[in-house]
Interface confidence: low
Amino acid sequence: QLGASGPGDGCCVEKTSFPEGASGSPLGPRNLSCYRVSKTDYECSWQYDGPEDNVSHVLWCCFVPPNHTHTGQERCRYFSSGPDRTVQFWEQDGIPVLSKVNFWVESRLGNRTMKSQKISQYLYNWTKTTPPLGHIKVSQSHRQLRMDWNVSEEAGAEVQFRRRMPTTNWTLGDCGPQVNSGSGVLGDIRGSMSESCLCPSENMAQEIQIRRRRRLSSGAPGGPWSDWSMPVCVPPEVLPQAKIKFLVEPLNQGGRRRLTMQGQSPQLAVPEGCRGRPGAQVKKHLVLVRMLSCRCQAQTSKTVPLGKKLNLSGATYDLNVLAKTRFGRSTIQKWHLPAQELTETRALNVSVGGNMTSMQWAAQAPGTTYCLEWQPWFQHRNHTHCTLIVPEEEDPAKMVTHSWSSKPTLEQEECYRITVFASKNPKNPMLWATVLSSYYFGGNASRAGTPRHVSVRNQTGDSVSVEWTASQLSTCPGVLTQYVVRCEAEDGAWESEWLVPPTKTQVTLDGLRSRVMYKVQVRADTARLPGAWSHPQRFSFEVQIS
């Protein structure tokens, strides 16, 4: 092992006189530390400030050999390490480990020698531990980060952390002495101990490192601090909000509308040691698509990559932009997609017979599940009802029929929006399509739709204006097709009907004769049925017109 030069080489000399203390120069070796690293290995390491080129370091170790204690004559050994700032040696190298040894470093640069402070050390019990070498498990709760790792020995070490953020320098924190927790935290490591550390979580990404120091039973340090562990990189506690734009096209012929996402997900600033290293960054951005319509279906949601083009039905959806980090998923943007408004309403194929009401629509491919959703359009708008329909056998007429008792739900006299959705895979919210969507007036539409408060006003010599309050059916888009105004002379000599568009509630009747008693009635018609006539209103030109 011994020779004249090269890393790790050593030489032994008698100590005559060596200068004490430091050279006083700001350049040169400093922070010398010597310690035990394993059963047989010892190490000295130091820092060096100054030009690196052509520098050569020598570690000096001076001691009184155990068999020379009576003379007190010190013997010195030196190790030349070249440009390296670490020297490792064994007991076989002749350095006593059970008695005091004085160490210092001389750094030679050309004809100049710089010297470190001298340290005195009993090496045997001064052990440098390792930092956590394996996986450091990180969890987050209540604005705190917790780190756990396994150690196979040296339970009871003192532990420190240091952390920095993209805009801050390192700050040091104390994890406190570790008590023996009995077993490892990371699963399948028999006989290992665990250590842990708490530090604050922040709204910026953090780089954290751990170091450990052996602690004697007295509480005093039993060695120098270990090196710092590999960086642990953690994302901010609260991630920045995304600003994604969602662009929706109208429903196409297939009953689906295309949704495009535009914009960048926010980029996280990370500390220097976390660049290119996992942990602090968002692993991926996702969109959670949740279909809010058809609640009778177990709530359907699906996660897709951000930016994926989606084809959705005309139903109501919630879209949450998620950021996936080492701690799980966080919502960084929410967007609500309302149900598509109906621009055109088509008549539903609804028939009433006895106390049953039936509805029919064109069947899609075999194996399709349908969802029929109805929603009161005015008073109880959030009382949405739905039913899932899975046709058991194919109808030869390629129609799906759904029947219900005319008593409850859909038979109160009010307007409902009815939508039928279809899917071959009902658990996937992105595979539904709108089959049809329209409005339906429940109950007896003929009776409920009868116009009220019909009034007649004289206009000119042979004409009158008839006005009425809008039919209840007019609140239900597309249900009311027309009003019919009927006027007849009581002597039976004349009668006529006027057709009025559903948006109007007034008509002028002309060509009437004086001194004749007339009666006028109004009805509201749907596409399916003519309405019931209103109560007759009588008038003539001789009498006061009311």
Epitope: V37, T130, E153
Partner: nanobody, 127 residues
């Protein structure tokens, strides 16, 4: 049975380079220590470098620090030792070794900790 197979040894002039490879089969590769040891004729087996496969943490024995680099390829279950600035005293049989324990501490430097050993590959450095 776990098998470790070294390759890449050979003869080289002082100052030259070699790259040793070790293929690990039927070995739980992740979260373990693997190491390179060497044994020169008439001498004891000594450590060269060790690595924690969980995160790539490397440890070098003082005689090779700054000249040798240990690395891994987790996907291929391979361990490598890049040896630069070779010296005649680096001449030895080089062995790949793997620990059975799932985690370790500084005892990664002791050959008694390693259960699985390869057959070795010879490196000869002439001046």
């Amino acid at each position: 049975q776990v098998q470790l197979q070294e390759s890449g040894g050979g003869s080289v002039q002082a100052g030259g380079s070699l790259r040793l490879s070790c293929a690990a089969s039927r070995y739980t590769y992740t979260n373990n220590f693997m190491a390179w040891f060497r044994q020169a004729p008439g001498k004891e087996r000594e450590g060269v470098a060790a690595i924690y496969t969980g995160d790539g943490y490397a440890y070098y024995f003082y005689s090779v620090k700054g000249r040798f680099t240990i690395s891994q390829d987790n996907d291929e279950n391979m361990l490598y030792l890049q040896m630069n600035s070779l010296k005649p005293e680096d001449t030895a049989m080089y062995y790949c070794a793997a620990m059975e324990r799932r985690i370790g501490t500084r005892r990664m430097t002791e050959n008694a900790e390693y259960k699985y050993w390869g057959q070795g590959t010879q490196v000869t450095v002439s001046s």
